[in-house]
């Protein structure tokens, strides 16, 4: 519920992580609380710990298997429960028929590098994390750069349609210091979203040549 | 947007069974949880029972453990309180909830659910 005193909401990242989030408003820091997950047709079950990140609200990493393993499918079905400790039992406080791939969310994309750079432009290339060879090609990511003086918010966000891990950035100023980022996002699941930006890239742009514009 | 509408509230006798039937048409969601909840004249809303649309997982109100069942129908998007044994207590305006993905809140409040219907009364006599 969107304005529940509450709420419970998690994110599959294609391949064997589970990230959840759950909110309440009035709850005291010191609550222990847990997520377990129950697929309808797998033999594991998970539990993580909730741990706080901010006055109300704790997150925790429902982890699979190994971080490349695909332990989920589009027709699987986990149930979530946040349990919360109350003296001496377990309450349940919030329950979910989670849709893996449904409610996608990707690692930020890695290993960022400046390919080739110039005065004007600049040739940056990454790669995805973790993410479903389900997916084969139908991927999409935003870009954006940072100019001197600007913030990340003002910076125009450039799309790419399809699974192309590299952008040429042009118009770009002479000895220029820049950042760049990028995130990925499935074409697939009603309730995806964005990954979280990458870590950015720091780069220069050549100086002009002396004698020329 | 998410439509309910209850149905198959009346005036029964202690003991006796009837069952409620909630109608969801509009936007309905496959992993939506549908819950039951009443409400008695001068009292709060109080959670009564819910159901997971897709696993189909329930959950009752301590009261109504083992008298009442909670079941559902996906293709008629139909959800169900079968109510046995009914008691005095048992009086009031039932009504069905959804609370629509990807969120869920804490399952027994009445403030976590998005969507509502207009109620249905049950009025059991001693």
């Known amino acids: 519920a969107v304005n529940g005193t509450s709420r419970f909401t998690c994110f599959y990242n294609s391949r064997a992580n589970i990230s959840c989030v759950w909110s309440q408003d009035g709850a005291l820091q010191d609550t222990s609380c847990q997520v377990h997950a129950w697929p309808d047709r797998r033999r594991w079950n998970q539990t993580c710990e909730l741990l706080p990140v901010s006055q109300a609200s704790w997150a925790c990493n429902l982890i699979l298997g190994t971080p490349d393993s695909q332990k989920l499918t589009a027709v699987d079905i986990v149930t979530l429960r946040v349990m919360c400790r109350e003296g001496v039992r377990w309450r349940m406080m919030a329950i979910q028929d989670f849709k893996p791939f449904e409610n996608l969310r990707l690692m930020a994309p890695i290993s960022l590098q400046v390919v080739h750079v110039e005065t004007h432009r600049c040739n940056i290339s990454w790669k995805i994390s973790q993410a479903s060879h389900y997916f084969e090609r139908h991927l999409e990511f935003e870009a954006r750069t940072l100019s001197p003086g600007h913030t990340w918010e003002e910076a125009p966000l450039m799309t790419l349609k399809q699974k192309q891990e590299w952008i040429c950035l042009e118009t770009l100023t002479p000895d220029t210091q820049y950042e760049f980022q990028v995130r990925v996002k499935p074409l697939q699941g009603e309730f995806t979203t964005w990954s979280p930006w990458s870590q950015p890239l720091a780069f220069r742009t050549k100086p002009a040549a002396l004698g020329k514009d | 947007q998410v439509q309910l509408v209850e149905s198959g509230g009346e005036l029964v006798q202690g003991g006796a069974s009837l069952r409620l039937s909630c109608a969801a048409s509009?936007?309905?969601?496959?992993?939506?949880?549908m819950a039951w909840f009443r409400q008695a004249p001068e009292k709060e809303r109080e959670f009564v029972a819910l159901?997971?649309?897709?696993?189909?997982?329930?959950l009752y109100a301590d009261s109504v453990k083992g008298r009442f069942t909670i079941s559902r129908d996906n293709a008629r998007k139909m959800v169900y309180l079968q109510m046995n044994s009914l008691k005095p207590e048992d009086t009031a305006v039932y009504y069905c909830?959804?609370?629509?993905?990807?969120?869920?809140?804490?399952?027994?409040?009445?403030?976590?659910?998005?969507?509502w219907g207009q109620g249905t009364q049950v009025t059991v006599s001693s």
């Open positions: 509009g936007r309905t969601f496959s992993n939506a949880n």
């Open positions: 159901i997971t649309w897709s696993s189909g997982s329930t």
């Open positions: 909830a959804a609370d629509g993905p990807p969120y869920s809140g804490t399952y027994y409040r009445y403030d976590t659910y998005d969507y």
